[in-house]
Every structure is written in C-alpha cells, then in structure tokens.
C-alpha cells in the first residue's frame, strides 16, 4: 500500500494576513486564526513528518480583501509560490479583473500548474492563452505518480468577468475524456481539484470513472468527524463518501473558507491505484500554531502599500452621503442607493440578448450601513471612509429566490417597525410600498420588481411563482437579521465580491457621486 | 548561480555497475527534482529517470528498471545514480538536469561519460 | 508511452534567416513540451518549457508555438551561434520522451 497526504485549502479569498475567528480584521492577535505565515508552519511541519505530501488550492483565491483591491492578483502568486502550492483549480472569482487580470498578475507568474479542465478558449484568446493554465498535470509523488485534474463552476460567467473568448463547458462532460486519457498512460491515482460547490463535487465523485479523490471549493463546505475545534457547524463527516456508480468508495473533501482551515486527508492506495482507505480532518490554524517568522516578514513588507491605498481618494460625492442610522433603518436612504447600485452595476453581465442583464435586485439591511459621509471634505472619498460604512468585511452575493420569499423578506423589514433594528430593507430594482396600519405579516402593499427580460426596463408586480435573482450581503444570504426564509428557501447561492472593493470600483468608475432618495420604499396609509 | 557538477569519467567492463555523482549548488537542493538523462555516441536523448530530493522518491523509464538506482545525499547537495549490469550499448554520456516548477528540465551538468568495454 | 516525431532532422539555413523545427506527439501532450539546443561535446541548454515560456537569458529570437500534438521552435533571425542540435521533449506522463533531434547546420 502507498500513502498520500493531500494538504488543501479553497475560497481563501485574499486571507492574507490573520484573521479573527469570523474571517473579518484581527484585532485580537492572541486569538487571531489563519493566514498564509500561520498556514506556511503547519504545512512545512507535515512535509517533513510525512513521505508524500501534496498542497493543493480548489479555487477563488482572489477577492476579499483590501490585499486583492491594491495587488489584484500578484500577491495570490508570490505566497503561493513562496508555499510551494503543487496545484491549483481556477474559481469563479480567479476572473473578477477579467481575463487579463488573471493572466499577467497570476497565471503567468505562478511556479505550480494552475488547472481546469472545463474552461476552453476560443478566438483570439486561444494562443494568447495556451499553456497558461491546463486541463490536468501529472506529479512525480515519492516513487508514483498522480494526476490531478481541475475544473471550475460553469456559473462563472454569470459569477465573473470572463469575457466571451472562454467556455466553460458541464464539469463531468469535460472531465471524463481527461480521466480516460490519463488511465490509459498508466496514471491510476487521480485527484479532480476544482471549484463548482460541494453538490457538484459529489456528482463529480460519483459520475466520473477514474476519479479517486474529489477536492472540491465554491460553497465554503465544512466537513468534520468529532467534535468541530471552532464555529462552523459540519456539514457532514470528513471526508464525506460518495459511492460511484460504478461501485467504488470516493472520498470528497473541502475546508470552509478564508485559510481558516488547512484540509489535511491521508488516502492508502493498493498497488492498481485503488483507494483502500481515507481518513482525515481540517486542521484549525489557530494561535497555538505560530506565524513563519520569514513569511510573516514578507507580509509586513507587502502591507506598507495597502496602509498608502486606504487614504487615497476613490472618487467625490457632492451630496451628503446619508448612512445614518436614523435614515437607513427608517426609510429609503441615499447611502443604501448608492450601494445597491453599486451592486447592480458589479453584475452587469450581457450573456444573453433576451436579457439586458442577469439580474435587477438588490436588498441590503439598513443595519449593515455603519457610517454617513459627509460631503464637505472637499467631496473625497477614500476606502478608510467606505470601510467605515461597511467595516465587516462582507460580501455582495447573488442569489435565486421565489417571489413568495422576496415578499416574506419585505415582510421581515417592517415586522417591528420603528425600533430602529437593523432588517429594514434598502433597495435597488424593487419598488416598494408599506402600510403600517396593518398588522406585522401584512404590511407590503405594492412589491414591483424589475424586469431583466427587457430591452426596457421597467416595473412589474411581484410574482410569487417566479424565481428571480437579487443581489444582497452575504449576511442577509446567511439568515442573518431574522432573514431565516432567505437562508432557508433558497434557491441557488454564489458567494460575491468583497463589499467595499464592490463600493469602491462603482465611485472610481462613476469618479463624482450624487445619489438621491427617489421613492423607491415608500409609506401608505389606508387602502391602497 | 544554478550549477549542477557530475563525477568524472569511467570506463567499466560489462556487467559492472556504475555510480554517477551530480553536486548541485546555486539553489535550495531540496525545492527541485532532478533528471538524469543519458546518450549514446552520435544518438539522441533519452530520459532515464527522476528522483525528488526530499523524499529520495524516484520515477524509473521502465526501460532501465531493475537496473538503475537513484539516490540523495541531502548534506552534500549530491544526487547519485548507479546502473547495474552494464553493457557495451549503455556507453554513454549520462547527464543530471535539474527540473524547474513544472517538472521540465532546466539546467544540465556537464555530463558524465561512461565507457563499457571488455 | 508517448511517441515523439521531430522534422526536419538537418537543415541547412543562412544566417539572418528564419528557422522552425515541428515537433508532433502521438497524443495530446497538454502544453507540455520543452526544447533543448546542443553544441557538439556539450551538454544540453533548456530554451523553452511550456511550449512557449523561454528561460531566462535566452535570445527573444527563439521563440515557441503549439499546443495539443503540434508544436513548433522558431528561430527568427539565425545567428552562427545558433549552428547547434535541437531536441524536444514532452513531458507530460512518465515516461518523458525526446524527439530525435534536429540538426541545423549554416550555409
């Protein structure tokens, strides 16, 4: 029997430096968790106590933080490759800066295989392209050999900005010929390393012939076997065992998110390269476990620069930016506008000539709005102010919902108005109307949403029947703010883009700012 | 800079083994693999094996299997490969190549000449 | 294991001239072709790996193309320096394959 060792991490999303236990700034550094200094020690430990290791990154290493804003990709290349990664999946997010953006900061200045399978290149793209990233690659490990096959959400170019050169093709379609093709040249130990969400893993462990690991990203996945060592709660056991349809145990594994965890799976393979056993958990990479003083020395150094970004102007505003929250829990505000519109514009996406775009809808708590700018600052506003409105390091996702959950959801916002609580709704695409003079559970008198099927758009009622797409924090996607129906009836959820780089792109793009409160939350009283 | 020092020439009669040195320096010995590649007078290229420094882990061309042996010293940053039961065809040069991060050869020694002869 | 064909075995250029040697693989091989230039008594010296990524301190005349089974080293302006053999090989599974080499001789 021949032992591996798979290290691996996914959705790190620009976790650079340690964090506090929810992902969000250290404050604390006595109880702060991850990071590449911390995560560096604990992988150079097990690579000298075990004979054949192997670490490998499932995806969506860019985006998160203001170390992706400022770098855009060239720091996910320098640590990983002072980490020595042996390979890595593309994620959605991988084309958040578009295709160049993944090209010149990462793909071309990796030292280790970047991967997936699914993604073809056509046109002009298809030469600038080739050899930067590949479908698989085979790693000498000890005195055998593994193929490692990537793949990547083919949601992405609803997700991402991959332009219309790439086609990403179904995961198990694109990846059976890949598997075959590396069976037939004798590599019978094959691990699929990629990025479609752990649904798709399992798909993919149990549908693809050959397959005998599945390391898988995309829907931040904790698995765990025993009493968990922090918050999340396990999905299932670790590995998680998916029975093919051809009879064979494949193990599937993902570690949450945010270099939180480093996922650690010993698999034993008998001689024809079958798995005989796995077993394994994600190691919590908490402040028992020291920072690398050299990679840690590095960080400070990279660091110097995000220090300088954060108090360079973005754009102006020349309307007060009204984040108060006597405005934003109360009423329509023009700071919950500007932000909803902000993510509307993140997700333009013209992949479809029926559609205009993909997606209209926005909602975003009024409790998530911290912090007012003011104006009269000369009219500046620099990501110091917007890390002020959005100081929890969230995201902006995009998800599908039935009407009838979008009117429960609107429904929640006023339950207990007038308490000034954080679940009052702002809005972009939605028009909206209350009566507080019913009773809580019936208060949403007028819901029109608009129309993304639409050479114009325009306003429509709500249907309850209908699945739409809304754009909201990953807080409210979540359950958060009593939002439980949102995280309950859900139909489909990808994690989105760093809040404040989502902010801040729209006031650099748009360069002078004057969001308006416009009717689209209004208040009735009687019949309507 | 990235230098790779082979052991100097060897004339051995068939059935004989041979061992081969390659000291590497320039690099941190254990981040790279390292190749070993042998040719023929007046012939092409031909790739014998790989071993990871590591881990002292190989790959063999099945072609030499039984035959070869690669092996480390990680004090001396020194990568060994011995071949057993010689013969006329195995006269050659035998070359060790580093390989970069994509397991592709970079840089070559100088090369090692071996002649089996009776 | 995976055949490797290189064409032509010799050619005869002048200097100044533009010289490609094709190398083609029984199968896909995946980008992952690299090519070698050999002075005679001399070990080789890597120019490409990736089918197309030149290492460092390697004249910007050579150049490489291909992907798939097709690949292909380009000489763009021949130098008398460049008087050498030239090898590929893929290494993409184990066993790595060379191709038979080329040898470019100045008219």
């Known amino acids: 029997a021949w032992e591996l060792t798979i290290l691996h991490t996914n959705d790190v999303h620009s976790r650079l430096e340690q964090t506090s236990e929810d992902s969000s700034k250290c404050v604390n550094a006595s109880r702060c968790m991850g990071g590449v200094a911390r995560l560096f020690t604990k992988v150079q430990q097990i690579r000298r106590a075990e004979p054949n290791v192997l670490l490998l990154d499932a995806g969506d290493q860019y985006q998160g933080t203001i170390w992706f804003t400022v770098y855009k990709g060239a720091e996910v290349a320098h640590f990983m490759n002072a980490l020595r990664y042996d390979a890595m999946a593309l994620g959605n997010h991988e084309f958040d800066n578009g295709v160049e953006g993944l090209i010149e900061p990462l793909l071309k200045e990796a030292k280790f295989p970047i991967l997936s399978a699914n993604i073809k290149a056509k046109g002009p793209l298809a030469s600038q392209i080739s050899g930067l990233y590949l479908p698989y690659k085979v790693l000498p490990v000890g005195d055998e050999v593994v193929g490692i096959v990537g793949y990547t959400s083919k949601e992405t170019p609803f997700l991402s900005n991959p332009g219309t050169n790439l086609v990403f093709e179904d995961e198990i379609t694109a990846l059976q010929p890949e598997v075959d093709k590396l069976k037939t040249l004798n590599v019978n130990k094959i691990i699929a390393l990629g990025h479609s969400g752990f649904e798709m893993d399992k798909l993919i462990a149990q549908k693809v012939r050959g397959v005998d690991v599945v390391v898988g990203g995309h829907s931040n996945t904790f698995l765990y076997t025993g009493n968990p060592p922090s918050k999340e709660v396990p999905a299932g056991k670790y590995p998680f065992i998916v029975t093919s349809d051809d009879g064979r145990k494949v193990p599937v594994v993902q570690a949450y998110a945010f270099g939180k965890y480093l996922g650690y799976l010993k698999i034993e393979f008998d001689e024809r390269g079958n798995v005989i056993s796995s077993h394994g958990n994600p190691i919590l990479l908490n402040s028992s476990i020291p920072e690398d003083p050299s990679i840690k020395a590095d960080i400070n150094k990279w660091r110097i620069k995000l220090d300088n970004y954060s108090t360079q102007e973005l754009g102006k505003t020349i309307v007060y930016l009204d984040g108060s929250s006597q405005s934003c829990r109360f009423r329509e505000c023009n700071m919950g506008n500007l932000i909803c519109d902000a993510m509307i514009n993140n997700n333009l996406r013209h992949t479809d000539e029926m559609f205009w775009n993909h997606v209209s809808m926005c909602i975003l708590n009024g409790g998530g709005i911290r912090s007012p700018i003011d104006e009269r600052n000369n009219g500046t506003i620099t990501w110091e102010n917007l890390a002020a409105v959005l100081p929890f390091g969230g995201t902006f996702d995009l998800v599908q919902l039935k009407g009838s959950t979008l009117k429960k959801a609107f429904e929640h916002s006023v339950h207990r108005y007038g308490q000034s609580t954080g679940e009052f709704l702002q809005v972009g695409g939605i028009h909206v109307v209350y009566d507080l003079s019913r009773k809580p559970g019936d208060r949403v008198v007028k819901l029109d949403v608009l129309c993304t099927k639409c050479r114009v758009p325009s306003y429509d009622p709500l249907k309850m029947d209908e699945v739409y797409k809304v754009i909201l924090p990953n807080f409210l996607a979540n359950g958060g703010d009593g939002f439980q129906m949102i995280k309950d009836e859900l139909l489909r959820h990808d994690s989105g883009d760093q809040d404040i780089n989502v902010v801040s792109t729209y006031i650099s793009k748009m360069k002078v700012i004057y969001p308006a409160v416009e009717g689209r939350i209004k208040f009735s009283t009687g019949s309507h | 800079q990235v230098q790779m020092k082979e052991s100097g020439a060897e004339v051995k009669k068939p059935g004989a083994s041979v061992k081969v040195s390659c000291k590497a320096s320039g690099y941190t010995f254990t981040d790279s693999n390292m190749d070993w590649v042998r040719q023929a007078p007046g012939q092409g290229l031909e790739w014998m094996g790989d071993?990871?420094?590591?881990?002292?882990?190989?790959i063999y061309n099945q072609k030499f299997k039984g035959r070869v042996t690669m092996t480390i010293d990680t004090s001396t940053s020194t990568v060994y490969m011995e071949l057993s039961s010689l013969r006329s065809e195995d006269t050659a040069v035998y070359y060790c190549a580093r390989t970069n991060w994509d397991y592709a050869m970079d840089y070559w020694g100088q090369g090692t000449l071996v002649t089996v002869s009776s | 294991d995976i055949q490797v064909t290189q064409s032509p075995s010799f050619l005869s250029a002048s200097v100044g001239d533009r010289v490609t040697i094709t190398c083609k693989a029984s199968q896909d091989i995946n980008s992952q072709l690299s090519w070698y230039q050999q002075k005679p008594g001399k070990a080789p010296k890597t120019l490409i790996y990736r089918a197309n990524r030149l290492i460092d301190g390697v004249p910007s005349r050579f150049s490489g193309s291909g992907s798939g089974t097709d690949f292909t080293l380009t000489i763009s302006s021949l130098q008398y320096e460049d008087m050498a053999t030239y090898y590929c090989?893929?290494?993409?599974?184990?066993?790595?394959?060379f191709g038979g080499g080329t040898k470019v001789e100045i008219k």
């Open positions: 071993i990871n420094p590591n881990n002292g882990g190989t």
């Open positions: 090989l893929q290494y993409d599974v184990f066993p790595r394959t």
